[in-house]
């Protein structure tokens, strides 16, 4: 906190310029008009102030705008954005994507800070949904952004925004998140032909139900093992050996290396050993010949 002192004669700032770096903190406080600072914030971003001097400038803006900064100031905060607390940011109303980009640029290369998380939250809530342009911007700066959202938050993503999602954006998503995103992706890509559709939908398949996997198995998609291992176990279990063979195509040989891992392990336990033997991979652990398999879930449904 800088104590209030009168501005020395001849030092009153007429504009925000380089000469201000020669002002002491108390002189900045006394000689720079807050309203002038607010209208010339863009100039602050070209002047090599010290961090201490920037603290004084922030203090002046805080006094001028106790209810929160207007967007005209926010857009030009530059480094000062990093000095804001989440509480400061919650007072803002940021509606312009350009403002969002400008502030994300300041934090570029760093982890998502509490300030950035609060800013994004305010921005998305202000827009009402996570539209394509916003999602494009956010995933460009933070590839893991989408997977940081709760399933409830993801439900506000319109299917049209799914076109902006890259495979790496989904790397850290868990099954609950993919359960929400998969139906949106299916809707977004529904007009694409078989092979193009599979390329686009592939990263979302961790949320796919059994019937969709069965349908894909009829389309010669040659799913790789990495994708197969990310499928929901409950979606894989009902697939027949023939369906898995068609789904994986030439990659079916990879099942041997994964036979002790989910979902392959659990799937093997559900298959007849006879059927597994047809693959010629030496997969073991299937239901021995002559055993009767009772589907208890079906029995419960009937009773």
């Amino acid at each position: 906190e800088v104590e209030k002192t009168a501005c020395p004669s001849g030092k009153k700032a007429r504009e925000i310029d380089e000469s201000l770096i020669f002002y002491k903190k108390w002189e900045l406080e006394a000689c720079v008009d807050a309203a002038l600072l607010a209208t010339q914030m863009d100039r602050v971003n070209a002047i090599p102030f010290t961090y201490e001097q920037l603290d004084v400038l922030k203090h002046k803006l805080d006094e001028l705008y106790p209810q929160g900064y207007p967007e005209s100031v926010i857009q030009h905060l530059g480094y000062l954005f990093l000095k804001m607390s989440p509480e400061d940011i919650r007072k803002w109303n940021v509606t312009s994507l350009e403002t969002l980009k400008a502030l994300l640029e300041v934090n570029k290369g760093h982890e998502m800070s509490p300030q950035v998380a609060t800013l994004i939250d305010r921005f998305v809530k202000g827009r009402g949904q996570l539209d394509k342009d916003t999602l494009d911007t956010l995933t460009a700066f933070y590839p893991g952004y989408l997977c940081s959202l709760s399933p409830e938050e993801l439900s506000s993503v319109p299917p049209s925004s799914i076109w902006a999602v890259r495979p790496q954006d989904l790397d850290t998503c868990d099954p609950r998140q993919l359960d929400v995103l998969y139906p949106k992706a299916r809707l977004a890509f529904q007009n694409m032909n078989g092979s193009e559709y599979f390329v686009k939908i592939q990263s979302f398949l961790g949320g796919a139900p059994t019937e969709d996997l069965k349908a894909l198995s009829q389309q010669n998609v040659s799913m790789d093992l990495a994708t197969f291992m990310k499928l929901r176990t409950d979606a894989v279990l009902p697939l027949t050996v023939a369906e898995v063979q068609k789904l994986l195509g030439p990659h079916v040989e990879g099942l041997k290396a994964e036979e002790r891992h989910r979902p392959v392990r659990d799937w093997i336990l559900r298959q007849r050993q006879d059927d597994l033997d047809t693959l010629g991979l030496g997969l073991q652990g299937g239901i021995p010949n002559g055993y009767l398999v009772l589907d208890l879930s079906m029995q419960e449904a009937l009773s």
């Epitope: 971003n45 070209a46 002047i47 090599p48 530059g78 480094y79 000062l80 640029e105 300041v106």
Partner: nanobody, 115 residues
């Protein structure tokens, strides 16, 4: 973002020193740079500044005519040439930078003693 100052030392009154400011982990070329100093027990004060192109320079009244700020973007370095040094120039000298989107950087300082 970190800046690194060097070139400080002990010098007699009337002597000269040249301080350098370089970037660690990024390039200085599009950064405007300011030199500031802090004498023991005193507040930091601005000494000089130079624009990113090098076309514009500014000096505090106390160093005008004695100090010259320059930059060599090929070497990604900014210099502060200090001539006719006085005991009152004794301080830790820091460089502070501002780049695109208002990104900021500052160094740890280099000590200058005139005695």
């Amino acid at each position: 973002l970190q800046l690194v100052e060097s070139g400080g030392g002990l010098v007699q009154p009337g002597g000269s020193l040249r301080l350098s400011c370089a970037a660690s982990g990024f390039t200085l070329d599009n950064y405007a740079i300011g030199w500031v100093r802090q004498a023991p027990g005193k507040e930091r004060e601005g000494v000089s500044s130079i624009s990113s192109s090098g076309g514009s320079t500014n000096y505090a009244d106390s160093v005008k005519g004695r100090f010259t700020v320059s930059r060599d973007n090929a070497k990604h370095t900014v210099y502060l040439q200090m001539n006719s040094l006085k005991p009152e120039d004794t301080a830790v000298y820091y460089c502070a930078g501002v780049g695109d989107y208002g990104r900021r950087a500052m160094g740890q300082g280099t000590s200058v003693t005139v005695s």
